[in-house]
Interface confidence: low
């Protein structure tokens, strides 16, 4: 069978599974005269043999873990033993079988985790090795937790990254672990080869002891601070502490106040920096943040609450320079004249703002002093001794002392004595007829003028007329403004008229005085008038129930998921057809009849959230009027973007030869959402073969350092693969390549002879 198992002498490669006893020859080389015999050299390990006639075979099972490639040479010799052909390279690749079990590097691991640590952030790695080929399932390891002790309510507090062996807290673990309740846990971890997918996989187990330590990064109790403190500032009011030394603290004022009177020092002590004023602001809420030296947040911010305690630092204030009341001549003892309402800026419902009223002077004192009483706490003025006579004293002036527990203020009240109110208002017309208006008549339009007259003393509360609509306008669409000089009433539109709900309204007005009528006089039919309002139909556009509709969904919802709905009604009762406008990404469709909105394509928060489209409601039939509203779809992040390099790192170089191991720093990012803390990536080399030459070490959640392990590099470009894991749910991993060139340098830059300028690196390390 020329070609497959026999043929002339030429370079060849053969693949043979390890662990198999020899069952056939490898190859039969044919000699070309003057060659008569063959000779085998190289990595034969006394396994590979060639017979003089050129038959290449092996005499016992191979072991890939001893040698994965045998580099052999075959030469053809003449009758004198002189090489006449070759030697040519013959490569034997030993193919892997699963003949090695994974083994943990340690039979017991110990670690600690702080309570409330971020879920998914590794705090310990277990590590197993398997001598089989990592490029095949035989050497691909799969870690899992066999048991967690203790297990409370069947809830797992710990999780393991199946591929990396990174142990972290679950969301429940982050919330519930408490060293006061349970300071230690034990995990049994298994590792399987074959990627954990085969019944024939080998496995090993290890034990992990975990100590839970207290998290001291906790929000302090709310602080109470007395306003207008005269103590020297700054004054320490509370403190926060990060779990380890060296954190950098700062305060974040979410309210963006023009004056933010708090500061934090490098020990985490929080100070008020100047006296506070409760009347300016009675409470503050701000955040304390701890960052590492690169300015990356170490954890979530803590909410700090400061309540400002009131002191009595505000006197009572009068409602106006002079408060004017009217009293009729014949009013009876005890009648209310009016209420003086003073104010106090101190805290409501406390002694600091509780007011007392006292009359300190009445002028004139005619016919006697003490004609008026004021209720001590309510401030209501009453007639105390007798009815008043306008011709004797038409006006009284009272000085009233208003006091809180520390301050006194004088307020001034003028009381005008007016004629008795013995005349009622009389409408000039009892019926103002019919008025026809279109339903889209502007708000604020005056639609009717009405007039009543009152024969009592002009420009007093006895003759002043107030008009009320007492019937026919339960929706409050109309109002009446009165001209104080003429008592003319102007009927105005306060709310839109509506043909659909009120086509005809029978309106009844009542005219009355602010002052009470004297005993025995009552309002009668003369004080009432009516008119009929007829509203005509105008075809109106549909009306949406909201100006903006908002919905929130996860960005990974299945196509066809209902993501929201809108509703509109047509005032005329016509059917409505819904449509979308501005769906630039083609993500959505709307049910024309129901207004339900569905996804029709994969959504992507990173393309922009919220996604804003317009919804259009159009009348079906009629004049097809339409109106527009907004639909805002807020997309909640899922971890769907693997980490990547934050910028282009082409052009990295080291000057060759290296005088000492070197390093460079690179930054990773991803497009997912990272609230407060920013990303927390973990970094590792992308393949095992890189580990002899390179080392990657994490600096912080986004930066890592790539270092050379030695100085013996060739003068060429190396492509270093880096594995970056985002620790998300699910964790996503990106493999990125950093091209690093080792080159001869002139004055710190890569030197290339003329004609070799392509791809010249530009950044030296």
């Amino acid at each position: 069978q020329e070609g497959k198992f026999s043929g002339p002498l030429k370079p060849m490669t053969f693949s043979i599974y390890e662990g198999q006893e020899p069952s056939q020859i490898i190859f039969q080389f044919k000699a070309n005269p003057p060659a008569v015999t063959f000779e085998l050299t190289g990595e034969t390990d006394n396994i590979f043999v060639i017979e003089r006639e050129g038959l290449l075979y092996y005499n016992r099972a191979l072991d890939r873990e001893t040698r994965s490639t045998h580099n052999l040479q075959v030469a053809a010799l003449d009758a004198n033993g002189i090489i006449v052909e070759g030697p040519v390279p013959i490569t034997i690749k030993v193919k892997d079988i699963n003949d090695n079990r994974p083994t943990f590097l340690q039979s017991k691991y110990e670690g600690s985790v702080r309570q409330n640590s971020r879920p998914g952030k590794p705090f310990l790695y277990v590590n197993a090795t398997d001598l089989d080929d990592p490029a095949t399932p035989n050497g691909q390891l799969y870690y899992q937790i066999v048991i967690q002790l203790p297990m409370i309510n069947n809830v797992m507090y710990f999780q393991i990254n199946n591929k990396t062996g990174a142990i972290s807290l679950t969301r429940e673990g982050s919330q519930e672990l408490n060293p006061a309740k349970n300071p230690s846990y034990n995990l049994v971890i298994s590792v399987k080869d074959m990627g954990g997918q085969s019944e024939n996989s080998f496995s090993d187990t290890t034990s992990v002891d975990i100590i839970v330590t207290e998290n001291i990064w906790k929000a302090p109790k709310p602080v109470e601070m007395v306003e207008n403190s005269t103590d020297p500032h700054p004054i320490k009011i509370t403190q926060v502490r990060w779990n380890d030394p060296g954190a950098q603290y700062s305060l974040v004022d979410k309210e963006k106040l023009p004056r933010f009177p708090f500061s934090i020092d490098q020990e985490g002590d929080i100070y008020v920096t100047q006296p506070l004023d409760r009347e300016e602001k009675d409470a503050y809420v701000f955040y304390a943040v701890a960052k590492d030296e690169y300015g990356k947040p170490l954890s979530y911010p803590l909410e700090i609450h400061v309540k400002v305690k009131d002191i009595n630092d505000n006197p009572p204030t009068c409602p106006s320079p002079v408060t004017v009341f009217e009293v009729q001549e014949n009013e009876r003892l005890g009648n209310s004249i009016g209420t003086l309402t003073a104010h106090d800026r101190d805290e409501e419902n406390t002694a600091n703002s509780f007011l007392n009223y006292r009359i300190v002077e009445q002028t004139p004192k005619l016919p006697m002093d003490g004609l008026f009483l004021i209720q001590t706490y309510a401030g209501m003025l009453q007639l105390a001794k007798q009815s008043l006579k306008k011709q004797d004293t038409p006006q009284y002036n009272l000085t009233i002392e208003v006091s809180d527990k520390d301050f006194k203020t004088l307020c001034f009240v003028q009381i005008n004595v007016i004629d008795i109110n013995d005349q009622i208002p009389i409408f000039e017309k009892s019926d103002y007829g019919n008025l026809t208006l279109a339903e889209d008549t502007n708000i604020g339009s005056t639609i009717l003028t009405i007039q009543a007259t009152d024969a009592d003393e002009p420009f007093t509360g006895s003759s002043k007329i107030l008009y009320h609509i007492i019937k026919g306008d339960s929706e409050g669409r109309l109002g009446v403004d009165t001209d104080p000089h003429t008592n003319t009433g102007y009927v105005i539109i306060k709310k839109p008229l509506d043909f659909e709900t009120a086509a005809v309204s029978n309106i009844v007005f009542k005219a009355e005085n602010p002052e009470p009528l004297v005993f025995g006089v009552k309002y009668n039919a003369s004080s009432f008038a009516k008119f009929t309002l007829i509203v005509t139909d105008v075809n109106e556009a549909p009306q949406f129930s909201q100006h903006v509709f908002q919905a929130k969904v996860s960005e990974d919802v299945a196509i066809g998921t209902k993501v929201g709905n809108v509703t509109a009604k047509d005032p005329e009762g016509l059917d409505i057809s819904y449509s979308l406008r501005g769906d630039t990404r083609g993500w959505l469709k709307i049910d024309h009849v129901t207004g339900e909105i569905f996804s029709v394509a994969p959504l992507d928060r990173e393309a922009g959230s919220p996604y804003r489209v317009q919804v259009v409601a159009t009348e079906v039939g009629g004049s097809s009027l339409s109106s527009v509203s907004e639909f805002h779809l807020i997309l909640m992040d899922v971890n769907d973007n693997p980490p990547r390099l934050a910028k282009d790192y082409t052009g990295l170089f080291f000057c060759h030869p290296l005088s000492a191991p070197g390093s460079l720093i690179f930054e990773a990012t991803d497009d997912d959402q990272h609230l407060f803390r920013g990303p927390h990536f973990t970094f590792s080399l992308g393949s095992g073969s890189l580990q002899n030459d390179w080392e990657v070490s994490k600096i912080n959640g986004t930066h890592a350092r790539l270092s050379t392990r030695h100085t013996e590099f060739e003068e060429r470009e190396y492509v270093v693969l880096i594995r970056i894991n985002d620790g998300g749910r699910p964790p996503l991993e990106g493999i990125v390549s950093l091209p690093v060139t080792f080159c001869s340098c002139v004055e710190g830059s890569c030197f290339r002879p003329a004609g070799h300028q392509t791809g010249i690196p530009t950044v030296g390390m």
Epitope: Q248, Q266, R705
Partner: antibody
Framework: EVQLLETGGGVVKPGGSLKLSCAAS????????MSWVRQTPEKRLEWVAA????????YYTDNVKGRFTISRDNAKNSLYLQMSSLRSEDTALYYC??????????????WGAGTTVTVSS | DVVLTQTPLSLPVTLGDQASISCRSS???????????LHWYLLKPGQSPKLLIY???NRFSGVPDRFSGSGSGTDFTLKITRVEAEDLGVYFC????????FGAGTKLELK
């Protein structure tokens, strides 16, 4: 007790070199940025150089850039100042100082006793 | 670089007196982050400098409350309410809003 102890000072000719060391004890050295500060014969204080916690970032005052190198060995709790091309104006008492990093502003809360460098022909 | 000018250069006092030292900066020390990085140190003969006040007015731990700092922008003051013997020495102001610099020092001595 928190302590910083400087060594390595001496008399050197202009153009010569000298390496100062500072041994830290009583605190977690790797948690703190460190600086060298000198006191001139006229009793003025001058900040010379600084280094961050892991040694990855260094800072220098303009008139020592290119001549002085600050470094640290966290495993040995030690800070160093390699001085070369020394000039007479470098004559001073050199203090090692622990800095609290206040964003981008430093103050020094622990100082050593100092070591004297004299540059003279 | 930012120049810090201290006045007076020498301040003779009687024990129990109040002392006041001024430090004026050639440019504002208010950082864009809202902090003002102006600090005060005391250097006593034969000793190393000691931190007294950081960020204008914050007393460092263990510093007696007779020491207080104040000021803003370019003008700053260190006050000692009742001078004691242990307070004698040279006081330096320092800024680290810009490249770190020190003032020339003020010598507090007995009359």
């Amino acid at each position: 007790e928190v302590q910083l102890l400087e060594t390595g000072g001496g008399v050197v000719k202009p153009g010569g070199s000298l390496k100062l060391s500072c041994a830290a004890s009583g605190f977690t050295f790797s948690n703190y940025g460190m600086s060298w500060v000198r006191q001139t014969p006229e009793k003025r204080l001058e900040w010379v150089a600084a280094i961050n916690r892991d040694g990855g970032t260094t800072y220098y005052t303009d008139n020592v850039k290119g001549r002085f190198t600050i470094s640290r060995d966290n495993a040995k709790n030690s800070l160093y100042l390699q001085m070369s091309s020394l000039r007479s104006e470098d004559t001073a008492l050199y203090y090692c100082a622990r800095q609290f990093l206040l964003w981008d502003g430093w103050y020094f809360d622990v100082w050593g006793a100092g070591t004297t460098v004299t540059v003279s022909s | 670089d930012v120049v810090l000018t201290q006045t007076p250069l020498s301040l003779p006092v009687t024990l129990g007196d109040q002392a006041s030292i001024s430090c004026r900066s050639s440019q504002s020390l208010l950082h864009s982050n809202g902090n003002t990085y102006l600090h005060w140190y005391l250097l006593k003969p034969g000793q190393s400098p000691k931190l007294l006040i950081y960020k204008v007015s914050n007393r460092f731990s263990g510093v007696p409350d007779r020491f207080s700092g104040s000021g803003s922008g370019t003008d700053f003051t260190l006050k000692i309410t009742r001078v004691e013997a242990e307070d004698l020495g040279v006081y330096f102001c320092s800024q680290s809003t810009h490249v770190l610099t020190f003032g020339a020092g003020t010598k507090l001595e007995l009359k």
